[in-house]
């Protein structure tokens, strides 16, 4: 069944003498593998023999391949799907029909392919877009219906015979659908390319010319113009005449309208290729150009800068910046319309010429208050000297100058006085608006720049004021030199360093922190009694009787100050010990007797020891010794010993007499 055979391949293949042809081909024989293949040139069916006649270019049978034309023709296919063929080299007489006779076990098929071989290499074909506009990128395509693996070729682009520097992209196709070689060139044409010849040249692998195709570029573009002016330098004086001419050097398509522009604005009623300006004024200075339009758009000429020269106009001064801060830099700029530009300037400060200042700008690197005032200038060019304008005012601002703090009081100032101070200054710009005082205190400011200190403190040493506008300027501090009575008077023990024991040498110092004036006197007092007039109070050998409350006084011409009372404590061992007996030194047996150890000690006695007449210690350590019930045998002399941290003291003997009770006497 012939419908079982399906072939795909290009319908016609093109080549030229000496080149090669590569025929991509696929097939499908549904009833089995290919058993026999014959490639015919111009086959014709012979009805008598029921076979095809014609030149056999290639033959392949079950018995094996039959060598044919010395391998010029090659079957590159297989037994079931590939039927690709190659003829290399290909000859002119290969043109015509190629017949692929295919036989499987049960079926046969003849597939026909057209081969067109020319005598010489045929030219490629250039494809252009329908319209080309200047500066718009286009793609030029060069197509050749040829490609063969055994015959490499190249396509080259030329503009007016010169290779184009833009990079072209070459692609090839050798598929069952199409066989071709294509070169694509991306290109942004300029108006100058209009009418130029573009060539696509076919070359062999060595660059040898084979064939070509050419096209003429039709580049649509706006009109290209040239402007001419008389006089040629376009420099005139007021009252002169000027002529400008507009020439079209190229336009595609043809131009339609003409107009003239000055400084980008269209000039009314000027629609010819010549512009005549009579008796020009300085206002006619500017940039002129002509504009010509076509269907693509308007084209403009280069600009001609017409300069109408005139003497400088009255000048104005611009100040960078006013008001200026003292110490900052300031720049003055003289502004005067003139053509040509002024070559010389004269500067004035408060109407007086500033020597050596001839430039357009005056720069003062460090502004001082005296630089304030009116600045004006005069500009000069070759046509004359301008007039002096109104000038500009420079305001120089600075902190208050020569600020001083002044004490209004008579001197000396005493602690507790009311002190008035004023804050004075020499000059200020802008005006002083407020004052500050150091140190800060809860003080009155009865008027601007005046400070009143009620009840001035002894430690108010110095006061400084500041006068403030946008800045504060501080005066040097002024010393109040407040006089006051001695302060922080206190009694200090110099020796001994530790606690005072009876018999120690003791020195007390009367200290004070400060006094103004410095000359002072000292007084020592105990219980209202004057003891001495030195800064120190000395005891060669302290006794317990010296203990008590001491004060010292320090006075100067302002007043006197007493210390806090200072307690002098003298430590001593127990003394003046004695044993007292209760209810008395004679007690009846069976009753209770209490012995008490009395003493004087500092610190107090911590414990006591009791002894009998044989100096035997009794197991008691408290101040009282209670004997209950008392016995006659307890009669005898008792004594006690007191102990503190300083030492011990003992009492003399005290005799206790215990007498018999009437009951005991009665029993005897």
């Amino acid at each position: 069944d012939s419908s079982k055979w399906v072939f795909e391949h290009p319908e016609t293949l093109y080549a030229w003498e000496g080149a090669c042809v590569w025929i991509p081909c696929t097939y499908r024989a549904l009833d089995g593998d290919l058993e026999s293949f014959i490639l015919f040139h111009n086959p014709e069916y012979n009805k008598n023999t029921s076979k095809f006649d014609g030149t056999r270019l290639y033959e392949s049978t079950k018995d094996g391949k039959v060598p044919s034309e010395q391998k010029r023709v090659q079957f590159l296919g297989d037994k079931n799907k590939n039927c690709t063929l190659s003829i290399h080299p290909v000859h002119l007489n290969d043109s015509g029909q190629l017949g692929l006779r295919m036989e499987s076990k049960t079926e046969k098929w003849m597939e026909r392919i057209h081969l067109n071989v020319s005598e010489r290499p045929f030219p490629p074909h250039i494809q252009l877009p329908p319209e080309i506009q200047e500066s718009q990128e286009v793609t030029l395509t060069c197509l050749l219906n040829f490609s063969c693996y055994g015959y490499p070729i190249q396509l080259q682009w030329l503009l007016e015979g010169v290779p184009m520097r833009q990079a072209a992209v070459t692609s090839t196709s050798l598929t069952i659908k199409s066989v071709f070689t294509r070169s694509e060139l991306k290109f942004s044409p300029q108006w100058s390319h209009h009418g130029k010849i573009v060539t696509c040249q076919l070359q062999d692998a060595d660059g040898k010319f084979l064939s070509n195709d050419t096209v003429q570029l039709n580049v649509k573009h706006t009109p290209k113009l040239e402007i001419k002016v008389t006089p040629s330098d376009a420099i005139v004086r007021e009252g002169d005449s000027v002529t400008m001419t507009c020439e079209v050097s190229s336009s595609n398509p043809e131009y339609t309208t003409v107009s003239w522009l000055k400084d980008g604005t269209s000039l009314k009623k000027q629609n010819t290729f010549t512009l005549n300006l009579r008796e020009v004024t300085k206002d006619q200075s500017g940039k002129y150009c002509c504009q010509v339009s076509n269907d693509v758009g308007p084209g403009r000429s280069e600009e001609v800068f017409l300069q109408v020269q005139y003497a400088p106009e009255p000048s104005t001064v611009q100040i960078l910046h006013s008001p200026a801060v003292e110490g900052s830099q300031v720049e003055f700029l003289c502004m005067s319309l003139a053509n040509p530009l002024p070559t010389n300037y004269t500067w004035y400060h408060n109407g007086k010429e500033m020597q050596g200042r001839t430039e357009e700008k005056v720069h003062i690197p460090k502004i001082l208050p005296w630089h304030a005032g009116t600045y004006s200038c005069v500009a000069e060019n070759i046509l004359g000297t301008g007039q002096r304008g109104p000038g500009a005012e420079l305001d120089v601002q600075y902190p208050p100058k020569k600020v001083t703090t002044v004490i209004q009081n008579p001197m000396p100032i005493r602690e507790g006085d009311t002190v008035t101070l004023s804050c004075n200054y020499n000059s200020s710009n802008p005006s002083v608006t407020r004052y500050e005082w150091k140190p800060h205190g809860a003080w009155e400011e009865p008027s601007l720049g005046v400070l009143k200190i009620q009840n001035v403190g002894w430690d108010n040493t110095t006061i400084a004021c500041a006068a403030c506008n946008s800045w504060c300027s501080w005066a040097s501090p002024v010393a109040l030199n407040v006089q006051y009575a001695p302060r922080d008077v206190r009694v200090r023990k110099i020796k001994p360093l530790s606690e005072i024991h009876s018999g120690n040498s003791v020195s007390l110092q009367c200290d004070f922190s400060s006094s103004h004036p410095k000359e002072v006197q000292f007084f020592w007092e105990k219980n209202g009694r004057l003891l001495g007039k030195e800064s120190q109070l000395n005891f060669d050998s302290i006794s317990p009787e010296d203990a008590g409350s001491y004060s010292c006084w320090v006075n100067n011409s302002i007043g006197q100050t007493a210390s806090k009372a200072w307690t002098l404590e003298v430590l001593y061992a127990p003394r003046r010990l004695r044993v007292s007996m209760s209810p008395g030194d004679q007690v009846m047996e069976g009753k209770s007797a209490t012995l008490t150890c009395e003493s004087d000690a500092n610190p107090p006695v911590s414990h006591y020891t009791w002894f009998d007449w044989n100096n035997q210690s009794l197991p008691y350590h408290s101040q009282k010794l209670r004997l209950e019930p008392v016995k006659v045998q307890h009669s005898g002399a008792y004594w006690c010993q007191g102990t503190n941290s300083v030492g011990k003291g003992r009492s003399p003997l005290s005799t206790l007499t215990v007498y018999y009770s009437p009951e005991t006497i009665g029993r005897r």
Epitope: H607, W613, N614, Q616, H621, R626, K631, H634
Partner: antibody, heavy 118, light 107 residues
Framework: QVQLQQSGPGLVKPSQTLSLTCAIS??????????WNWIRQSPSRGLEWLGR?????????DYAVSVKSRITINPDTSKNQFSLQLSSVTPEDTAVYYC?????????WGQGTLVTVS | DIVMTQTPSSLSASVGDRVTITCRAS??????LNWYQQKPGKAPKLLIY???SLQSGVPSRFSGSGSGTDFTLTISSLQPEDFATYYC?????????FGQGTRLEIK
């Protein structure tokens, strides 16, 4: 080595007299550096000092105020012992009774006698 | 009478712990304060006399301090045999008085 050995009944009837003896070995009741004490201990009262006897140049006694009217502590030099007598006892007097020597603190104690008043 | 107050009344601690017991007298007793240890069924045992003196035969981990009215017994590192009741006692004046005791238990 000082030892104190207590003796006396463990049960006393209310209103009767509690009598305990403490025999001393290793020291003398007449020592002029020691004091001889009676102390009792009960859950309700804790450790309670009752009194002491000691000899210096004579014999002395000290008693706790709480028992002063009912207590007697006597030395017996011949037997080198000292005794406690507590009269008119009540169940409140139920306790463990200890004798102890005091030189610098109670350094030697008797073994203790549990006396129950019932 | 001089009243002796011990704190705390009971205390739980572990072997190796450092333990402090305080005793306060109602009036100054100088250094006439003694410390005792008592185990159940036994008589008290003197540990410290005169506030800080260690009684002969008592381990050195026991120490005492203080004078006047405030006193302290310290056991530097508790041993298993130290769990007992501790008493302070003043011998400054008669009547001789004891603290109410501090019971030291194993935690």
């Amino acid at each position: 080595q000082v030892q104190l050995q207590q003796s006396g009944p463990g049960l006393v009837k209310p209103s009767q007299t509690l009598s305990l003896t403490c025999a001393i070995s290793g020291d003398s009741v007449s020592s002029n550096s020691a004091a001889w004490n009676w102390i009792r201990q009960s859950p309700s009262r804790g450790l309670e000092w009752l009194g002491r006897t000691y000899y210096r140049s004579a014999w002395y006694n000290d008693y706790a105020v709480s028992v002063k009217s009912r207590i007697t502590i006597n030395p017996d030099t011949s037997k080198n012992q000292f005794s406690l007598q507590l009269s008119s006892v009540t169940p409140e007097d139920t306790a463990v009774y200890y004798c102890a020597r005091d030189v610098e603190g109670f350094d030697y104690w008797g073994q203790g006698t549990l006396v129950t008043v019932s | 009478d001089i009243v002796m107050t011990q704190t705390p009344s009971s205390l739980s601690a572990s072997v190796g712990d450092r333990v402090t017991i305080t005793c306060r007298a109602s009036q100054s007793i100088s250094s006439y304060l003694n410390w005792y240890q008592q185990k159940p069924g036994k008589a008290p045992k003197l540990l410290i006399y005169a506030a800080s003196s260690l009684q002969s035969g008592v381990p050195s981990r026991f120490s005492g301090s203080g004078s006047g009215t405030d006193f302290t017994l310290t056991i530097s590192s508790l041993q298993p045999e130290d769990f007992a009741t501790y008493y302070c006692q003043q011998s400054y004046s008669t009547p001789i008085t004891f603290g109410q005791g501090t019971r030291l238990e194993i935690k």
